[in-house]
């Protein structure tokens, strides 16, 4: 066998920009513009393939959006010495379909991350852990913005895109101190039952314009904190006894639960009780039905248990195909 | 050590079609994106396609859509690269390459392709 | 589709003598690679993101540009150094990667 032809003949794949030359104290990379009074670097639409190696060692606030890069890999921020002030970074809209493990290693003060608006066909597991550890260091955000990073289709090869946020968002335990998570836009159909249990420092939570059905097997008991959760435009059509009491439960929460196809029969009876009694929804006077047909756009808060009724099912015997 | 060794070249016919691999060591395979890559004799190099390190993005060069597919089995640290409806221009040694912190950071030694009736 | 054109595509330079290989680019690019390859061996990596070397690869080697030019610089020509130079960048999306036609080197 022959070896791989490289000039690197240590440790592989070290990231290369941690070896790269330091930058000059001024330095602004090329399509970039540079505030070292504002310590912010914009690098904004400028078709961008790559994440600038020349990073000036002052940035705080770093923007990315509007590139074409496609692959973030692993220490794609790294270098010698590291961008220890590096705290908000913003890379939507850039096209990227991979997140590989480590991507954003040796950001000690990275506290806001946006990758809204790329179709992630690949995040990692270890995107935001940075390592396979069952317990990794914890990460320093305190933001992650999600919106809109699902991938086509075409690039979802019928696996669970739900499973694969959800294993980034888990990993490692690594997001233990996450005030602020953004997940809107991305079809979900579920959430995966652990996500939430891992994450007890939420905050803010958006699941916005996504196709939930059921929030059945979704606990939010472990979010003392939350003080607002964003359902709306979902596809929810009734809350259960045991999501409506662990809502109930949560000390400072507003829940938002807009336009969604609310399904007006004998199993809305608990939540329209409890709506009429809660000030955990806010808007909820705008609340209607969609289903039945016969209840359409009447309004949650103005119902009473006569007007939810079921169907009755008729016994085997007496049923016509 | 990184190893990358390419093997499953040979003499193939025009419209033939034959199966590239390329076994890889001493990284962890897994965790990063791989390139083929292919120079005809005499010629420079020609980038021929990319799988990431999750298999779900794949990317092809024009010349190869539609013909050439990329797959590789992380369980076993292996590329592979199917090439079907196979033209004399195809003839070249081809490489893979990781992509790894940059695009082609490591190559392997090649293996020959010769499409000839 | 973005064409990297080198020049010269051939040359030869004696030992101590400063060579430069230039890259253009047909549209602007934020940075550029560049790669050895002697003869019967495969590339490798030696100047990436415009002017970061390669591990192992000589001091006397530097690598500059901007836009749609860039070039790779010997200080001083050394026997080791005769190879084919390739530069290489990606453009568009989904990316496309392309490899410049190459630079042949040759020792005087």
């Known amino acids: 066998t022959s070896s791989a032809s490289s000039s690197s003949s240590s440790a592989p794949f070290l990231a290369s920009a941690a070896s790269a030359q330091p930058p000059l104290p001024d330095q602004c990379p090329a399509l970039c513009e540079c505030s070292e009074a504002a310590r912010t670097v914009k690098c904004v639409n400028r078709n961008l393939t790559e994440v600038p190696t020349d990073l000036p060692l002052y940035v705080r606030n770093l923007f990315l959006t509007g590139n074409q890069l496609a692959v973030l890999p692993a220490g794609a921020f790294a270098r010698r010495p590291p961008l220890a002030e590096l705290a908000a970074l913003n890379l939507s809209g850039s096209r990227l379909d991979e997140v590989r493990g480590g991507a954003f290693e040796h950001l000690p003060s990275l506290r806001q991350l946006d990758l809204s608006h790329n179709p992630l066909a690949y995040l990692s597991p270890f995107a935001f852990s940075g390592s396979n550890a069952s317990i990794s260091a914890p990460s320093p955000l305190v933001e992650l913005i999600l919106n809109h990073i699902v991938p086509p289709d075409d690039k979802r090869q019928n696996r669970s895109f739900e499973g694969m946020v959800a294993a980034a968002l888990v990993a490692g335990r690594a997001l233990q101190g996450l005030h602020l998570l953004e997940l809107a836009s991305n079809h979900f159909l579920y959430l995966p039952r652990d996500v939430l249990a891992q994450l007890p420092s939420l905050r803010y939570l958006d699941l916005s314009n996504n196709s939930l059905v059921s929030l059945t097997y979704v606990s939010f008991r472990n979010l003392t904190h939350l003080e607002s959760l964003h359902l709306e435009d979902n596809a929810l059509k009734v809350l259960h006894n045991g999501t409506l009491a662990e809502l109930q439960g949560l000390p400072h929460v507003r829940v938002f639960l807009d336009n969604n196809p609310w399904v007006c029969d004998c199993h809305m009876a608990d939540m329209v009780t409890w709506l009429k009694q809660t000030g955990v929804v806010q808007g909820k006077d705008r609340l209607t039905c969609a289903f039945p047909e016969k209840m359409r756009n009447r309004v949650l808060l103005e119902l009473n248990s006569a007007d939810l009724d079921c169907d009755p099912i008729l016994p085997p015997s007496l049923q016509t195909s | 050590e990184v190893q990358l060794v390419e093997s499953g070249g040979g003499l193939v016919k025009p419209g033939g079609s034959l199966k590239l691999s390329c076994a890889a060591s001493?990284?962890?395979?897994?965790?990063?994106?791989m390139h083929w890559v292919r120079q005809a004799p005499e010629k420079g190099l020609e980038w021929v396609g990319y799988?990431?390190?999750?298999?779900?993005?794949?990317y092809y060069a024009d010349t190869v859509k539609g013909r050439f597919t990329i797959s590789r089995d992380n369980a076993k640290n292996t590329l592979f690269l199917q090439m079907t409806s196979l033209r004399s221009e195809d003839t070249a040694i081809y490489y893979c390459?990781?992509?790894?912190?940059?695009?082609?950071?490591?190559w392997g030694q090649g293996t020959t392709l010769t499409v000839s009736s | 589709q973005l064409v990297l054109t080198q020049s010269p595509a051939i040359m030869s330079a004696s030992p101590g003598e400063k060579v430069t290989i230039t890259c253009s680019a047909t549209s602007s690019v934020s940075s550029m690679h560049w790669f050895q390859q002697k003869p019967v061996t495969s590339p490798k990596l030696w100047i990436y993101?415009?002017?970061n070397l390669a591990s192992g690869v000589p001091t006397r080697f530097s690598g500059s540009g901007s836009g749609t030019s860039y070039s790779l610089t010997i200080s001083r020509m050394e026997a080791e150094d005769a190879a084919t130079y390739y530069c290489q960048q990606r453009s568009g999306y989904p990316p496309i990667f392309t490899f410049g036609s190459g630079t042949k080197l040759e020792i005087k």
């Open positions: 390459s990781t992509y790894g912190s940059n695009p082609f950071d490591y």
């Open positions: 799988i990431s390190s999750g298999t779900y993005v794949v």
């Open positions: 993101s415009t002017s």
């Open positions: 001493g990284f962890t395979f897994s965790d990063y994106g």
